[in-house]
């Protein structure tokens, strides 16, 4: 059977006026997954995103991540979109450094 991913979005300061937002998916099976950043619902071009490899996490499941740099103040326009085993979810950028969003999707 399939195991849905845990999805976690974090933010960190990049350079002045910019932040790096990272979307991590973990504990999912099988390994095929779509993870991408969207702006206003439109996928960002590949050259503006960085992806991690899909790696085993030691529990028979997998993990991966995608990151991009955005302008501070524009966070509301951006979401991380995940598709896995016929299910999908959308994840906003948390409002501040201390906020992390963890969601398990079924």
């Amino acid at each position: 059977g399939s195991v849905p991913p845990m999805v976690n979005v974090t933010r960190s300061e990049a350079s002045e006026g910019n932040i790096t937002v990272t979307c991590r998916a973990s504990s999912f099976y099988p390994r095929n997954i779509t993870l991408t950043w969207r702006q206003d619902g439109v996928s960002l071009s590949h050259d503006t995103q960085q992806w991690g490899d899909v790696l085993p996490d030691g529990n028979g499941t997998y993990q991966t991540w995608v990151a991009t740099r955005i302008c501070q103040g524009e966070e509301q326009r951006f979401t991380c979109y995940m598709e896995h085993s016929g299910n999908h979810s959308t994840h906003p950028v948390p409002s501040g450094n201390s906020h992390h969003h963890h969601h398990h999707h079924h």
């Epitope: 206003d40 619902g41 439109v42 071009s45 999908h88 959308t90 994840h91 906003p92």
Partner: antibody, heavy 118, light 108 residues
């Protein structure tokens, strides 16, 4: 086949409100944003706002944020745009559209003509 | 707000001729955020070209797009009867999302 079907034409009095519906089919409703755009007779296209049906986030064109209300009903996979305090200048065709993988508007509804007249 | 100015407002040409439509932006736009739409009378717009130069699904190869920065172009290499319509450019780089005022391609 992806389709967005909108509600029928409306005639409204100045000062009243109108609510236009948009029912997409052919894809997972919550996977794409729904945009709203209007076009006055013989004029160009004007973006009103969009809603993310999955998380319910709404982004408005500031020009419309005081009068437009975007909502979705996930149980019926339907999006709505309500415009209040109507005036004659709001006479237009109102379109819903779906956000695409690579562009803001990849599929469009057929449009709903809203006529504001006393 | 990024203002998109399309020129000319009307283009009068005959079938078989080449059409060149311009879209000028008030601020620089990444090529990823400039799109073109076609609209025929009584119909909704339809996506023609996305991200400056990519043909949308089902759009014939006589359509092409180019440009960068503030100047973008839509070209129809040889006009077919069904190409006579209004064409809009649109930017998605900054809010509010905006459209050009349109160029009408009419039969001469």
């Amino acid at each position: 086949e992806i389709q967005l079907v909108q509600s029928g034409a409306e005639v409204k009095k100045p000062g009243s409100s109108v609510k236009v519906s948009c029912k997409p089919s052919g894809y997972a409703f919550t996977s794409n944003n729904i945009y709203w755009v209007r076009q006055a007779p013989g004029q160009g296209l004007e973006w009103i706002g969009y809603i993310d049906p999955y998380i319910g986030r709404i982004i408005y064109n500031q020009q419309f944020k005081d009068r437009a209300t975007l909502t979705v009903d996930k149980s019926t996979s339907t999006a709505y745009m309500e415009l209040s305090s109507l005036r004659s200048e709001d006479t237009a065709v109102y379109y819903c559209s779906r956000s695409g993988e690579r562009s803001n508007f990849d599929y469009w509804g057929q449009g709903t003509l809203v006529t504001v007249s006393s | 707000e990024i203002v998109l100015t399309q020129s000319p407002a009307t283009l009068s040409l005959s079938p078989g001729e080449r059409a060149t439509l311009s879209c000028s932006a008030s601020s620089s736009i990444s090529s990823n955020y400039l799109h073109w739409y076609q609209q025929k009378p009584g119909q909704a717009p339809r996506l023609l070209i996305y991200r400056t130069s990519n043909l949308a699904s089902g759009i014939p190869a006589r359509f092409s797009g180019s440009g960068s920065g503030t100047d973008f172009t839509l070209t129809i290499s040889s006009l077919e009867p069904e190409d006579f319509a209004v064409y809009y450019c649109q930017q998605g780089g900054s809010l509010p999302l905006t459209f050009g005022q349109g160029t009408k391609v009419e039969i001469k």
